[in-house]
């Protein structure tokens, strides 16, 4: 059976605050839990959602959360269902509202000595207590001429007289909180001697050097006085005008006329009415000078045919707010249709190529007019002027592939080689018209090329195959000087490629034929056993029908390769003594000997007084120091061959002889003693 471990319980809650209805279930198997509100399943929202089995409220709402909540647990396998106890919220809230006239029915019916009742429309739960204010001052119950009924939230003035005139507001507070009236009520009970507003001046915006008129009228018995002041409290009369208001005229009906308005005339004008009794009434109005700023520039726009696009015209800052309209070809755009104005936007629906051109946004107010053009291009899909053609390009020469297209705006052309985008480098160049130049055509440039021409409206592409016409060339060119080892077998290769497979043959440079022990096998010169006479100049000739022939000259030298007669040995020398590293090599041509010590070649011309290389190749180092220790390499080389051998040199301190050692005791290692 399904058992509720925790059941939801009715509770107090505050409007707009968090709350939680708990529900915890224990059952033999899995169950799913959902909530009902007045019998209907509760849908999760961001404000009210299931949190595990409980129902969480991020912000209690007195309207949406009033009712009975119930937690339901269902075992969908067995169909068993259990329901919790019902729970509801006692939601505490307070909500502001206006002060309204309850009696009489309208303000027009308020007369001196009539009863006036005002109602405070602040509501809440629990019912709040109310406090009334006139002009911000609290009204206490039981004061003369008014009564407060908290139950009906009413303030009654009986009878109402001019002394009750003022701004009436109310506040209410409860256990939940406090709220004050959202809109207050101005009670105006006329005292005939008090000045009353008949006509109040309005703010005016005028263009420079135009005229401005402020109207102002008061009434009272006896008639009230009227005075105009400018910002700096300077009175304006027809007899005494401030220096900057020379062109001001006050009419008998109270209106103030300013002619040829300048920037210094802008500001606040005050009209003051004073009755025989009562406070002065001060009415304010502002004179603004019309102004209009420049409009920001438009970026040129590119649109595609068939689409719908909008261009927003930001009106320039101005006073009064400038009106905005769009024109095309000198004609104002309508407010509906295919190309029309909507608000400040230019709308182009189902764009056609003919819509391209200059559109002008106009803005105007009293201060003047501004305009800004936007250039609209209607993009077209590129069309072919010349597609790339299958081409035969000569190796080593520049090659060109055309991709000539036209469109609006000018199309962008990219090239692909074997589906890979070609980026411009030293070998590839794409001209402005779309043509691809391959600077020096190579054999592996023979493949597929594809060009794509695009505009925002779409793209076209075409491909072409490039066949490279190979040069007749040696691959690789034979080394011009080569050595062969005397009395050994030797081969000299020569291979070439061309448009047709070339024939390759060798001949001696003097034109004499090759001896019988020398064979020419498909371009490889083969010496069975090299003799001295085989040395000399040879020519490799490659030829084919269409491309003729090419020649490569090779000078063959016969040499006895280098061998070492004497090699340096591992040597240990006492510090301050002389070290001798012997090295002798033989070969033909006679090899030269060079030494390398501690990873640098020892230049015989810069050896200094301690080192010397003998004619036979041996190296001597006098007065050896520890820093001379290291590996020394003897390098023997001639024009055909190079060989090296190395040995380490150790420099050690001379040991102090111990008494037990005899004078003839040998050192513990091989030693050169000098």
């Amino acid at each position: 059976a399904i058992v509720f471990i925790k059941q939801p319980s009715s509770q107090d809650a505050l409007q707009g605050r968090r709350a939680l209805l708990r529900c915890e279930v224990e059952a033999p198997g899995p169950v799913h839990v959902y909530w009902l509100l007045d019998g209907a399943p509760v849908q999760d929202t961001e404000r009210r959602f299931a949190q595990g089995s409980s129902l969480s409220f991020a912000a209690v709402d007195r309207l949406q959360d009033s009712g009975t909540f119930q937690c339901v647990a269902r075992d969908d396998v067995t169909g068993e269902e259990a329901r919790s106890a019902n729970a509801s919220f006692n939601i505490k809230w307070i909500e502001a509202g206006p002060v309204v006239l309850k009696h009489p029915a309208s303000e027009a019916e308020i007369q001196p000595q009539t009863q006036v009742t005002l109602r405070c429309h602040i509501d809440g739960h629990p019912r709040p207590t109310y406090q009334w204010f006139r002009d911000g001052t609290p009204l206490s119950d039981g004061q003369s001429n008014h009564t407060v009924s908290s139950k009906e939230r009413n303030l009654t003035l009986r009878p109402a007289g001019p002394e009750h005139s003022g701004l009436y507001s109310c506040c209410a507070h409860s256990a939940f909180g406090q709220a004050c009236s959202s809109q207050n009520f101005t009670l105006s009970i006329a005292d005939e001697s008090f000045a009353r507003v008949v006509l109040a001046p309005q703010d005016v915006v005028v263009a420079r050097y135009e005229e401005a008129m402020f109207h102002c009228q008061f009434s009272a018995q006896p008639p009230p006085s009227l005075q105009w002041l400018f910002e700096d409290e300077t009175p304006i009369t027809n007899r005494s005008r401030p220096p900057h208001l020379r062109r001001a005229t006050v009419f008998a009906n109270g209106s103030l006329l300013l002619t040829q308005v300048r920037p210094r005339n802008a500001g606040i004008y005050r009209c003051i009415g004073q009755g025989q009794r009562g406070p002065p009434i001060i009415l304010e109005a502002t004179l603004h000078l019309a102004e209009i700023e420049d409009m920001p520039l438009f970026e040129p726009r590119v649109f595609t045919a068939g689409s719908e696009e909008r261009v927003t015209c930001l009106p320039p800052k101005g006073l009064p707010e400038p009106s905005v309209w769009w024109e095309h070809a000198g004609v104002r755009l309508p407010t509906h249709g295919r190309v029309y104005q909507k608000g400040h936007e230019l709308v182009l629906a189902n764009i056609a190529e003919s819509d391209a051109g200059v559109y002008t946004c106009h803005a105007a107010n009293l201060a003047g007019q501004r305009r800004q053009d936007v250039n609209i291009t209607v993009a077209t899909v590129p069309s072919w002027l010349k597609k790339p053609q299958d081409s035969q390009l000569e190796e080593g020469k520049p090659g060109y592939l055309d991709c000539l297209t036209q469109a609006t705006p000018k199309p962008t052309v990219v090239w692909y080689r074997n589906q890979m985008l070609i980026s411009e480098d030293s070998r590839f160049e794409v001209f402005k018209n779309g043509t691809l130049r391959i600077n020096s055509v190579e054999v592996y440039d023979g493949t597929w090329y594809r060009c794509m021409s695009s505009t925002p409206a779409g793209s076209i592409e075409a491909q072409a195959r490039v066949q490279v016409l190979e040069k007749l060339k040696f691959t690789p060119p034979p080394q011009p000087q080569q050595c062969m080892e005397f009395d050994k077998e030797a081969t000299v290769p020569c291979s070439a490629t061309g448009r047709e497979k070339p024939t390759i043959k060798w001949e001696r440079a003097d034109g004499s034929s090759l001896p019988e022990w020398v064979t020419d096998n498909a371009g490889t010169l083969h010496f069975a056993r090299v003799t001295r006479d085989d040395a000399g100049n040879y020519t490799c000739i490659a030829s084919n029908g269409p491309q003729g022939q090419i020649r490569a000259h090779v000078q063959l030298t016969v040499a006895v390769f280098i061998t070492f007669k004497v090699e340096p040995e591992r040597t240990t020398v006492y510090q301050g003594h002389t070290a001798l590293l012997q090295c002798e090599a033989q070969g033909d041509p006679k090899p030269l000997i060079q030494w390398k010590g501690k990873d640098r070649i020892l230049d015989p011309t810069k050896l200094g007084p301690r080192m010397h290389i003998f004619q036979n190749g041996s190296l001597v180092i006098h007065d050896v120091a520890p820093e001379d220790s290291g590996r020394y390499t003897c390098i023997a080389g001639n024009s055909c061959n190079i060989k090296h051998t190395e040995a380490p040199l150790y420099v050690v301190d001379k040991p102090v002889p111990e008494e037990s050692e005899g004078p003839g005791s040998p050192p513990p290692y091989k030693m050169i003693q000098t």
Partner: antibody
């Protein structure tokens, strides 16, 4: 033994009405939810609606208005009232308690 | 309207095969897990295999397993047995006490 037995199926003309019964034994309806599911010949299962332990009903959107589920706890029986029947309502109608316990089904044929 | 889509609609396999049936819902099921799988053989009432997405019903062999969350679920038969050739249905439960079945997957012998 806990079981469900449907009855009331048969032949009915288009536009006619029929009431199916599902009698439960071995348990009390007031603690369980009961589903009605139908299966047209050679077709898949189709959920019709549910009556929960409190007697509240919920329906598939296509069933609202024409089909009504009710129960009589004293008879331990759930009903499916079907009005304005159409040829496409021809099916075997099953009642089921949760996922596990199903009746044998009753065939409803709507034909003129 | 809630739509539950099973795939494939029909499936041919051999004894010993691993079989996966998927069920996709047009909206998330309640609690992201209120989904059941049934097996039905001709002329019989459906039989519960899996409930709450992955729980094996009583008496159902362990070769049947379920997984998924939200709106996408799978039924896996790890090694098909001769008795497993039947039609399989998924059923989802949704907020507001609404339920719906998939259109079914018919599993036949290859």
């Amino acid at each position: 033994e806990v079981q469900l037995v449907e009855s009331g199926g048969g032949l009915v003309q288009p536009g006619g009405s029929l009431r199916l019964s599902c009698t439960a034994s071995g348990f009390s309806l007031s603690n369980y939810v009961m589903n009605w599911v139908r299966q047209a010949p050679g077709k898949g299962l189709e959920w019709v609606g549910i009556i929960d332990s409190s007697g509240s009903t919920y329906y598939a959107s296509w069933a609202k208005g024409r089909f009504t589920i009710s129960r009589d706890t004293s008879k331990n029986t759930v009903y499916l009232q079907m009005n304005s029947l159409r040829a496409e309502d021809t099916a075997v109608y099953f009642c089921a308690r949760g996922h596990y316990l199903w009746g044998q089904g009753t065939l409803v044929t709507v034909s003129s | 309207e809630i739509v539950m889509t099973q795939s494939p609609s029909t499936l041919s396999a051999s004894v010993g095969d691993r079989v996966i049936i998927t069920c996709q819902s047009s909206q998330s099921v309640y609690n992201n897990n209120l989904l059941a799988w049934y097996q039905q053989k001709p002329g019989k009432a459906p039989k519960l295999l899996i409930y709450y997405t992955s729980n094996l019903a009583s008496g159902v062999p362990s070769r049947f397993s379920g997984s998924g969350s939200g709106a996408e679920f799978t039924l896996t038969i790890s090694s098909l047995q001769p008795d497993d050739f039947a039609t399989y249905y998924c059923q989802g439960g949704y907020n507001g006490n609404i339920y719906a079945f998939g259109q079914g997957t018919k599993l036949t012998v290859l």
